[in-house]
């Protein structure tokens, strides 16, 4: 598994560095999930053939994965920090099913898809220490998120490999519209 | 083999519309941020602005605000010159921005050969 | 919006020799968001260095960059012919969440 930020050699050696600000530790954060996602979508697509299923096959998917959309404030027209940050926490907590679901999707990235839910946690409280309004913030349903969990692992193996395949790609375009809004903040 | 190519730059009148598109191949275009970049002639290169294909989203340099609309398909990503004027003219080129690989961003890492903008009445 | 200016522009250097090229920002950086790219006449940018200092797939490791915060450098040593071009930084910043080229460098390789 990759070094978490903030921990790798060049960091240390290097204490005449500016610390970094609180959005650049978000940043390196996201990058650093990134880069896990980056390892498990190589190991899916290896396995199986869904990188290569055609976007019609996979948009017919009933998958509620989150996704920013112009109202959330996220992009540069109508950009609103506090709506977005909202947007991005309640995006990622939805997506902690998702990721317990890829938990026992991988042989040889099993500690890499840990690492990713881990770091997640981890970006979680970093952008609730950031936000304001935390009474916005709705957090999914625990009764809700079992069921779901229960749903999905009960599929057949192609809608599984179908499965683990969205959501990585999925919550890859989230942490990646979710960059360059967190870059204004 | 992964291209970009631009094309659809000519000669327009200053206020006349003008898209250009910006086709990839062997890239998913989802899994990319796509920006835009021009060069006057004999002058230095200046940033436009991005498109994160997956989502949609765009992010225009301030002095491109308003000038400026780079939209995608799931093969191309245009860029609109709203309103042209003679300080458009340029080449204007496409370039993929290599965030996929292992969370390193900003860096344009495959760039078209650029298609030619001339404005002038 | 942020400028990078670059130093010094034209530079001239001998086949061997090694040329530094200085690229410093109106603002920090965002996360050492800075780019370095090579430029022939009629050819499009080719990226060397990012993240100020990581070389880029199958760029010859006499490329070299530095820097952090305002202050970036671009070092070529063993300066060959093939090296003659105009060179430009980018840097990327989280004012407007703006990107912006510096105004290159011509190096002549003597």
């Known amino acids: 598994a990759p070094v978490p930020p903030g921990e790798d050699s060049k960091d240390v050696a290097a204490p005449h560095r500016q610390p970094l600000t609180s959005s650049e530790r978000i940043d390196k954060q996201i990058r650093y999930i990134l880069d896990g996602i980056s390892a498990l979508r190589k190991e899916t697509c290896n396995k199986s053939n869904m990188c290569e299923s055609s976007k019609e096959a996979l948009a017919e998917n009933n998958l509620n994965l989150p996704k920013m959309a112009e109202k959330d404030g996220c992009f540069q027209s109508g950009f609103n920090e506090e709506t977005c940050l909202v947007k991005i926490i309640t995006g990622l907590l939805e997506f902690e099913v998702y990721l317990e679901y890829l938990q026992n999707r991988f042989e040889s990235s099993e500690e890499q898809a840990r690492a990713v839910q881990m770091s997640t946690k981890v970006l979680i409280q970093f952008l609730q220490k950031k936000a304001k309004n935390l009474d916005a913030i709705t957090t999914p349903d625990p009764t809700t998120n079992a069921s779901l969990l229960t749903k999905l692992q009960a599929q057949n193996q192609w809608l599984q490999d179908m499965t683990t395949h969205l959501i990585l790609r999925s919550f890859k375009e989230f942490l990646q519209s979710s960059l360059r809004a967190l870059r204004q903040m | 083999c992964q291209s970009v190519e631009e094309s659809g730059g000519r000669l327009v009148t200053p206020g006349t519309p003008l898209t250009l598109t910006c086709t990839v191949s062997?890239?998913?275009?989802?899994?990319?941020?796509m920006s835009w970049v021009r060069q006057a002639p004999g002058k230095g290169l200046e940033w436009i602005g991005i498109?994160?294909?997956?989502?949609?989203s765009t992010w225009y340099a301030s002095w491109a605000k308003g000038r400026f609309t780079i939209s995608k398909t799931s093969t191309t990503v245009d860029l609109k010159i709203t309103s042209p004027t003679t300080e458009d003219t340029a080449t204007y080129f496409c370039?993929?921005?290599?965030?996929?690989?292992?969370?390193?961003?900003?860096?344009?890492?495959?760039w078209g050969p650029g298609t030619l903008v001339t404005v002038s009445s | 919006a942020a400028v990078l200016t670059q130093t010094p522009s034209p530079v001239s250097v001998p086949v061997g020799g090694t040329v530094t090229i200085k690229c410093q920002s109106s603002?920090?950086?965002?996360?050492?968001?800075l780019s370095w790219y090579q430029q022939k006449p009629g050819q499009p940018p080719k990226l060397l260095i990012y993240?100020?200092?990581k070389l880029a797939s199958g760029v010859p490791d006499r490329f070299s960059g530095s820097g952090s915060g305002t202050q970036f450098t671009l070092t070529i040593s063993g300066v060959q012919c093939d090296d003659a071009a105009t060179y430009y930084c980018?840097?990327?910043?989280?004012?407007?969440?703006?990107?912006?080229f510096g105004g290159g460098t011509e190096v002549v390789v003597k």
């Open positions: 062997g890239i998913d275009l989802s899994d990319y941020a």
């Open positions: 993240q100020a200092s």
């Open positions: 370039a993929r921005d290599g965030y996929d690989d292992y969370g390193d961003f900003d860096r344009l890492d495959l």
């Open positions: 603002q920090s950086v965002y996360n050492n968001f």
């Open positions: 980018l840097g990327g910043y989280d004012d407007d969440a703006d990107n912006a």
């Open positions: 498109i994160y294909a997956g989502s949609g």
